[in-house]
Amino acid sequence: LRPSRVYKPEGNTKRALTLKDILNGTFSYKTYFPNWISEQEYLHQSEDDNIVFYNIETRESYIILSNSTMKSVNATDYGLSPDRQFVYLESDYSKLWRYSYTATYYIYDLQNGEFVRGYELPRPIQYLCWSPVGSKLAYVYQNNIYLKQRPGDPPFQITYTGRENRIFNGIPDWVYEEEMLATKYALWWSPDGKFLAYVEFNDSDIPIIAYSYYGDGQYPRTINIPYPKAGAKNPVVRVFIVDTTYPHHVGPMEVPVPEMIASSDYYFSWLTWVSSERVCLQWLKRVQNVSVLSICDFREDWHAWECPKNQEHVEESRTGWAGGFFVSTPAFSQDATSYYKIFSDKDGYKHIHYIKDTVENAIQITSGKWEAIYIFRVTQDSLFYSSNEFEGYPGRRNIYRISIGNSPPSKKCVTCHLRKERCQYYTASFSYKAKYYALVCYGPGLPISTLHDGRTDQEIQVLEENKELENSLRNIQLPKVEIKKLKDGGLTFWYKMILPPQFDRSKKYPLLIQVYGGPCSQSVKSVFAVNWITYLASKEGIVIALVDGRGTAFQGDKFLHAVYRKLGVYEVEDQLTAVRKFIEMGFIDEERIAIWGWSYGGYVSSLALASGTGLFKCGIAVAPVSSWEYYASIYSERFMGLPTKDDNLEHYKNSTVMARAEYFRNVDYLLIHGTADDNVHFQNSAQIAKALVNAQVDFQAMWYSDQNHGISSGRSQNHLYTHMTHFLKQCFSLSD
């Protein structure tokens, strides 16, 4: 037997993190996002749940909705109508999938100081929103869309086709919610509130995934979800626009699909209102390398929506799939014709382009061996965007302003030098026309949120600086975090290393690789975090490493598209390469190396453990994908094509975890999955377990009854991290 090794942080009065700290969320941080209601006014929910109004220019602030009113209906969220006469209060939040939930809604009349009675809203509602002007309400109930001209008015039913698990109006089905829209809604008001655009998803022909939900009853319930796996029948999608001024006169009008898209299976990808009578729709072929942006206009004479061919813009990838994770959306300029959009330039880096007439004549606005990530706002004279350009670190995010009024346009980094050590990863929230904006810095130091003048970029005030967290961390021994790059052949891999306190290069430490590695993801980010791996470094003396291998984002298409049609190859190879490089650094105990990951990371960690290299002693896979045939069509096919003989079936079969069952014989493997995982179905782990049993390979496993992909209920999460900690400590011979 090897002697057990106990890591003891030496020398000072500071204490190490404990697992309890992590599970209790003791060191969680706060961010502050203003809820903008005008150019210079915003709302924010205070610590004690009052809804407070702020005016930046007059410096006035007052409670517009008291916590007692919130409490009277157990409200957890709110929404002010644009005419400021009403507030909806949201309660009885009931989570469905990643973004979707149902809730009960109450309308509070701010002028009368009472709840609106009569024609109360049905319950539970799937989605509800105010019009952008006035106080019209659109809501989705039982898969149909309803409209109220005023909160106290009777509702007008816009759609009648809605049917549970069959037809969805104004809300996405499972696959569109998770893999395409990333929202709980599929309806959009025109800027003046005259028109309402919405999507109808017909899931009638989609195969059903069914799983048991055990609950407390004598018999389990069966959850049925129309869920298209790779190669299966997909939702049939249609887009409609209804005139909400006279919804009964005309009825919803269907927006035509571009001919080049409609000729085979296709997806709707997003809708952007350009003006009160102009709308932009984005479509995508099922083989997701061709995207079409279509600009449509309302023709008063026929009361019709027209999408002429000369307003169709095609975006195509010849090396992989269109877009990043999603196809980017356009940011239209004031002329309501030209727009700015992020797509790959000739060198394969995603950059901002200006499109005036055709994509072929697009003017490239940004360029370089880095990527533009998001366009926040386009105003008359400025364009605000984020990128990872600064100092060449792909895992940073800074906010830039391009003065588009100037010729040539001039570029300024708004955030690069504000709090250089503390803040290297920003996002922003702009008032309507960017007169003011908030910056939210996520790290690498303590997160901080600040308010700025949109013209001068001057900081006006600190909104949240996490002082309490700073104080509570004073007596904690936090690990040291390094972000560096390693080279192998012609490839460069960025990695983040979390080193135990009092780290000594002359000593040997166990190594845990944390991996995600999915296409267009990024793990090596300059952000603040105190989580499970922070604890493992701080208390247990484990070195943690995260590596962004091929297929990860924001380093150009050559790196990103390397994994196209062959998932499970280079992601794994690059983790192995990194481990070998870490061993060469001299402070890693080669006998004590582990890998763990969740979801796509569970897939990669499983394949790495089964690589036959002998690099890993043990590893954990939580909710892993085990075959791309088991996962959602939109995701799997984006990166793998179709699982058909004449397309890519061979690699679908070669890239399964089950195909490598024999190779798990010489590693300790812990397989974990929630039984009510709607996303990566329990089927994935069931098949791994079956293959391992058939191969007579010993392994450890844990299931979490009735838990979904996040295994996030308090009790389950505690059990999960405690269980994984025991497994790792045993693997690394660390005593309890």
């Epitope: 409609f240 009008m253 927006v255």
Partner: nanobody, 121 residues
Framework: EVQLVESGGGLVQPGGSLRLSCAAS??????????IGWVRRAPGKEEELVAR????????RYADSVKGRFTISCDTSKNTAYLQMNSLRAEDTAVYYC????????????WGQGTTVTVSS
């Protein structure tokens, strides 16, 4: 080749009814890019779009002058649109044209040859 052929016109007394048909060939009226309309032209009057339908969505629109009296519909299995005209008045006398509009091209309209409706006692 696209063709629209109207039928059903004729002489009718005030208060009477007629049903006009518009048989389309060369394009699909069920396509989301297609709108079918009935346009009338009468001597000394401005051309008027009396009704239009988008068969894919069932979206209909009527001129105020015919609201509640005329009904536009389509039978996609026959690729045919109809205009049911009730409570006809003398001012409804006109040549009625079936028009097909493509939502993929500005003002690109196919026209039929027209059918005459005369309302007179």
């Amino acid at each position: 080749e696209v063709q629209l052929v109207e039928s059903g016109g004729g002489l009718v007394q005030p208060g009477g009814s007629l049903r006009l048909s518009c048989a389309a060939s060369g394009f699909n009226i069920k396509d989301s890019s297609t709108y079918i309309g009935w346009v009338r032209r009468a001597p000394g009057k401005e051309e008027e779009l009396v009704a239009r339908i988008q068969c894919s969505a069932g979206s209909t629109r009527y001129a105020d002058s015919v609201k509640g009296r005329f009904t536009i519909s389509c039978d996609t299995s026959k690729n045919t649109a109809y205009l049911q005209m009730n409570s006809l008045r003398a001012e409804d006398t006109a040549v009625y044209y079936c028009a097909g509009r493509s939502a993929r091209s500005y003002s690109y309209i196919y026209w039929g040859q027209g059918t005459t409706v005369t309302v007179s006692s």
